[in-house]
Structures are given as structure tokens and as C-alpha cells.
């Protein structure tokens, strides 16, 4: 590994009201001549490691969350790794951790509030 | 490229405190990773410690959760472990290393003997 | 706690011979929620594989990683010298994080 993948979330929480779809943002820098064959990432829940959607070998792997989770696919190769969590419930409240790895790797924490 | 490196008593006496560093190099501990503890000993293998962000927000593994504090010094590009009341069972080799879900790179690792 | 179950305990194989490590989790997991890595004496372990199949920068392509569910498999194509060691799966979609006992690949 050359350097850590910087990955960038915002520093507030997310606050959405139950029902609502939420975004959880998630960023990082592609460096130039990137593929997203060469991306994995991988959301899940910060404390239990629990899968809740993934990227990897060039495709969307889908939702491992009750399947109300989808990425932006047209933004993936710009560097936007963020997650749409729909319908949101009290249950979602909690922390979600953003992994991404491109050769190296990087990771970040966005907390999700439930109104 | 990222390099860690341990440092710490290698002779801790039975109920006493394990304290290790672990000093980063060919990078910033500021940046989004996590910053782990790992132990191997020949009863137990390899047993993940615990963790820690930069934002100073640490994971314990259950078992060592009520001995184990992991704390971070950004200022001196370090992290350090604490495990208190040990025993001759926490006599291991002792690596930190980086990641939230697999670890890259390892540090060298150090042996800790605990025993009177 | 996911537990990782490693088999053989040693493998005793010639250069140039094909290895097949096997690591078996005491629950489903994701195949992208597990690593491999080599451990020579006196070194701290090497990531090998992640994902269950991307290689770690600079590791040959004779090692490739398999598996889904409970089953996971590592493969050395042709054993260079270099290669004899030990070698440990770890599950990374559960916390805590978790190893396997190790597989050692001894010479022959």
C-alpha cells in the first residue's frame, strides 16, 4: 500500500423521519486511469460489522439490509460511495461505517438519526 | 507506505499493567483508518484486542473488554495499549496494526511475558 | 463469536505441487467478509487475499482465494520455496473480528 484511501463522511449526523428515505454521504478521491473494477465497497453496521450493502468486482452486489439500501451506480466512479437507506425505521438509528478499498483502503462512520 | 511499529516492557509482574505503543510512520494516524491491537500466544492464536479512530472512538473485543483501554496521541503519531490485572494467559506476542476490517500493514510485533 | 475452523493442521507438499488450505465458519458470512494471510516464524502476518479473492498488493498470482457460505478456500498454484509457512483465515462480517488456528505448509 502506497497511502490511505482517504474517506470522507459528514461530521453531523444524518436526521430523517421514520418512513422517509435518508442518505448516508460518502466520499473519496479516485485517483486518475480509476475503474471501478479495481473498487470494493462495502457498508456496514460500525459496531456489529453486520453486512448492509456492498460493491465489489466491478458490480453491484446489492443490499444485505432488509433490501431497502441502493448505491448511486452513475456517481460510484466520481468518488460518491454514498448509501440510500429507504423507509427508514426507529431500528436504522446507529452508526454505519463506510469501507473503501482500491489497492489500499480507508473507512468512516456516519451516524444515522431516527425523528 | 505505512509503517507500525511496537515498543513496551516486554516483563509485566502477574495483576499488574501491560502498556504499549505503537508508532506510525510513512503516514498520518489522521487519516480514515482504524488502529488495532492484535495478540498471538500458542493457546489462543491470533485474537484481535481492540481498535481505535482518530476521532478517538474505540471497539473492545467482549472477552478483554473490562481490562482493555487503547487510546491515541495524534500529536506524536501514535496509539497505545493499556490491559490491566494480567496474568501469565496474557503472554503473547503483541502486533498493532491497521484496518477496520482486514489489517494492513502489521507492525513487527513484540513479545510481553507476564511472570514474577 | 464466528469461529474459524482450519484443515488440514499441516500440509506436507513438494515445490512446484499444488496446496488446497480449507477454512470452515461457524456461520454463514458474506464471501466479501473474509481475509487470508501468511505468517513465516519470527514475522507478523502478511494479508494475502481479501474479499475472499482480491489479492493483496504485490502477491503473485499463484494464490487465489474461493468459497462462499461456510466454506472457504485458499490455493497455491505451484509452492515456491517461499512459500512454506503458516496461514490463517480471518472473518471480518462479524464482530468481534476472528481467526482461524492456522494451516501449517510444511516441505515434504
Known amino acids: 500500500p502506497t497511502g490511505a484511501v482517504e474517506v470522507q463522511v459528514p461530521e453531523d449526523p444524518v436526521v430523517a423521519l421514520v418512513g422517509t428515505d435518508a442518505t448516508l454521504r460518502c466520499s473519496f478521491s479516485p485517483e486518475p486511469g480509476f475503474s471501478l473494477a479495481q473498487l470494493n465497497l462495502i457498508w456496514q453496521l460500525t459496531d456489529t460489522k453486520q453486512l448492509v450493502h456492498s460493491f465489489t468486482e466491478g458490480r453491484d452486489q446489492g443490499s444485505a439490509y432488509a433490501n431497502r439500501t441502493a448505491l448511486f451506480p452513475d456517481l460510484l466512479a466520481q468518488g460518491n460511495a454514498s448509501l440510500r437507506l429507504q423507509r427508514v425505521r426507529v431500528a436504522d438509528e446507529g452508526s454505519f461505517t463506510c469501507f473503501v478499498s482500491i489497492r489500499d483502503f480507508g473507512s468512516a462512520a456516519v451516524s444515522l438519526q431516527v425523528a | 507506505q505505512v509503517q507500525l511499529q511496537e515498543s513496551g516492557p516486554g516483563l509485566v509482574k502477574p495483576s499488574g499493567t501491560l502498556s504499549l505503543t505503537c508508532a506510525v510512520s510513512g503516514g498520518s494516524i489522521s487519516t480514515s483508518n482504524y488502529w488495532n491491537w492484535v495478540r498471538q500466544s500458542p493457546g489462543k492464536g491470533l485474537e484481535w484486542i481492540g481498535e481505535i479512530y482518530p476521532t478517538g472512538n474505540t471497539n473492545y473485543s467482549p472477552s478483554l473488554k473490562s481490562r482493555v483501554t487503547i487510546s491515541i496521541d495524534k500529536s506524536k503519531n501514535q496509539f497505545s495499549l493499556k490491559l490491566n490485572s494480567v496474568t501469565a494467559a496474557d503472554t503473547a506476542v503483541y502486533y498493532c496494526?491497521?484496518?477496520?476490517?482486514?489489517?494492513?500493514?502489521w507492525g513487527q510485533g513484540t513479545l510481553v511475558t507476564v511472570s514474577s | 463469536e464466528i469461529v474459524l475452523t482450519q484443515s488440514p493442521g499441516t500440509l506436507s507438499l513438494s515445490p512446484g505441487e499444488r496446496a488446497t488450505l480449507s477454512c470452515r465458519t461457524s456461520?454463514?458470512?458474506?464471501?466479501?467478509?473474509l481475509a487470508w494471510y501468511q505468517q513465516k516464524p519470527g514475522q507478523a502476518p502478511r494479508l494475502l487475499i481479501y474479499g475472499a479473492s482480491s489479492r493483496a498488493t504485490g502477491i503473485p498470482d499463484r494464490f487465489s482465494g474461493s468459497g462462499s457460505g461456510t466454506d472457504f478456500t485458499l490455493s497455491i498454484s505451484r509452492l515456491e520455496p517461499e512459500d512454506f509457512a503458516v496461514y490463517y483465515c480471518?472473518?471480518?462480517?462479524?464482530?468481534?473480528?476472528?481467526f482461524g488456528q492456522g494451516t501449517k505448509v510444511e516441505i515434504k
Open positions: 480471518q472473518q471480518y462480517g462479524s464482530s468481534p473480528r476472528t
Open positions: 496494526a491497521r484496518g477496520y476490517n482486514y489489517f494492513d500493514p
Open positions: 456461520q454463514s458470512i458474506n464471501a466479501i467478509l
